[in-house]
């Protein structure tokens, strides 16, 4: 004969554990019945009666089965330099990532806590390693023979054109100028954009125009180029 | 207000190991990139090494390549030096900087106020 | 690695001098050249970026100028807390080496 399937609540049989969806309710030592993603537990089970689950309220979640007493509430707002990528919803948490042009600088466990804007490298520099979600673009100087006349944290040093005759040479920041009209070949087309990165950990020593980064955040920097601008927090 | 305080500087025999830890505060710390520089006495300046916000990129002086590593802990606003194989010629104050912005904004703007490491037998 | 050579290495000037430092590159550098203003028992403190920014607090009695590979701060009217030693250092390729320094001394 097989064997009767309990319904919740039941005590289980010494040394075994409840069911899948189930838990054990130390007070009524019963196993009773989890409330779905969506609910919470409205009132615990009882010796003789089970759980009694409630949906979630407007703005509070939960993701799992579970038996909490209060659904979760969601994460606040996504702030100015962030996206939404998941709304708030009776089972699933509001995920906030950092728009294009930032990357993530401090991470939470879903989503991002600081966003700041990606580092522009200044003319003479070019992107060595494009910026991602979750880390800032890496600069290096142009090295001879290229140059980088922009303030971008897209644009890579690009060759210096090849000229019949040079009026002025190229330098990191500048491009070859020639004085026949045209020049044999153009190595330089327009603006070149480093292609998605390989995210790789690197140890440079660069003694060869090798990347090198620095803060792309604009905020507590008092002068100059200002480096980071401040990124704002998702909480 | 900007703060860089060293710590883990002392006496130690040549050959031996330090590791130096820089607290940082007063600013989003993992956006910005730090290095190391030293002094030693009656000397100038000299770079030693360089992170960048992520602690992707690393750059070392030739002097201390192979032998120091620098690190960060983005979750505990703190920047480190570890040094190995030290040598009486690495007796110096060693000062935790802010910055370069590299490729962006070059220039150390913040020092903390240093701590000692002498090498010595 | 580029070499800097910062001149003099040592000057005495009284209160109200003009006072020229000069740092000399073995390449160009793309005025990507910073001061410092360095006290006895205290780290350096940002004087100069860009090789003719003013720094965030720094007086205007302060200014640098120059490009390529050579480079100038000048200090229009020397101050008594002005007595210091001076250092420029490159931001192009690593390593990223400081001038020797100059001392300012009163005379």
């Known amino acids: 004969l097989p064997a009767q399937v309990a319904f919740t609540p039941y005590a289980p049989e010494p040394g075994s554990t409840c069911r899948l969806r189930e838990y054990y309710d130390q007070t009524a030592q019963m196993c009773c019945s989890k409330c779905s993603p969506g609910q919470h537990a409205k009132v615990f089970c009882t010796k003789t009666s089970d759980t009694v689950c409630d949906s979630c309220e407007d703005s509070t979640y939960t993701q799992l089965w579970n038996w909490v007493p209060e659904c979760l509430s969601c994460g606040s707002r996504c702030s100015s330099d962030q996206v939404e990528t998941q709304a708030c919803t009776r089972e699933q948490n509001r995920i906030c990532t950092c728009r294009p042009g930032w990357y993530c600088a401090l991470s939470k466990q879903e989503g991002c806590r600081l966003c700041a804007p990606l580092r522009k490298c200044r003319p003479g520099f070019g992107v060595a390693r494009p910026g991602t979600e979750t880390s800032d673009v890496v600069c290096k100087p142009c090295a001879p023979g290229t140059f980088s006349n922009t303030t971008s944290s897209t644009d890579i040093c690009r060759p210096h054109q090849i000229c019949n005759v040079v009026a002025i040479p190229g330098n990191a920041s500048m491009d070859a100028v020639c004085t026949s009209t045209s020049p044999t070949r153009s190595m330089a087309p327009g603006a070149v954009h480093l292609p998605q990165p390989v995210s790789t950990r690197s140890q440079h020593t660069q003694p060869t125009p090798e990347p090198s980064t620095a803060p792309s955040t604009s905020f507590l920097l008092p002068m100059g180029p200002s480096p980071p601008a401040e990124g704002s927090t998702g909480d | 207000e900007v703060q860089l305080v060293e710590s883990g500087g002392g006496l130690v025999q040549p050959g031996g190991s330090l590791r130096l830890s820089c607290a940082a505060s007063g600013f989003a710390f993992s956006t910005y990139d730090l290095s190391w520089v030293r002094q030693a006495p009656g000397k100038g300046l000299e770079w030693v090494a360089y992170?960048?916000?992520?602690?992707?990129?690393?750059y070392y002086s030739d002097t201390v390549k192979g032998r120091f590593t620098i690190s960060r802990d983005n979750a505990k606003n703190t920047l480190y030096l570890q040094m190995n194989s030290l040598r009486a010629e690495d007796t110096a104050v060693y000062y935790c900087v802010r910055g370069p912005f590299y490729g962006s904004a070059n220039y150390f703007d913040y020092w903390g106020q240093g701590t000692l490491v002498t090498v010595s037998s | 690695d580029i070499q800097m050579t910062q001149s003099p290495s040592s000057l005495s000037a009284s209160v109200g001098d003009r006072v020229t430092i000069t740092c000399r590159t073995s390449?160009?550098?793309?005025?990507?050249l910073p001061w410092y203003q360095q006290k006895p028992g205290k780290a350096p403190k940002l004087l100069i970026y860009?090789?003719?920014k003013l720094a965030e607090g720094v007086p205007s009695r302060f200014s640098g100028s120059g490009s390529g590979t050579d480079y100038t701060l000048t200090i229009s009217s020397l101050q008594p807390e002005d007595f210091a030693t001076y250092y420029c250092q490159h931001f192009w390729v690593t390593p990223w080496t400081f001038g020797q320094g100059t001392k300012v001394e009163i005379k």
């Open positions: 992170i960048n916000n992520g602690g992707i990129s690393t």
């Open positions: 860009d090789a003719t």
């Open positions: 390449e160009s550098i793309y005025s990507n």
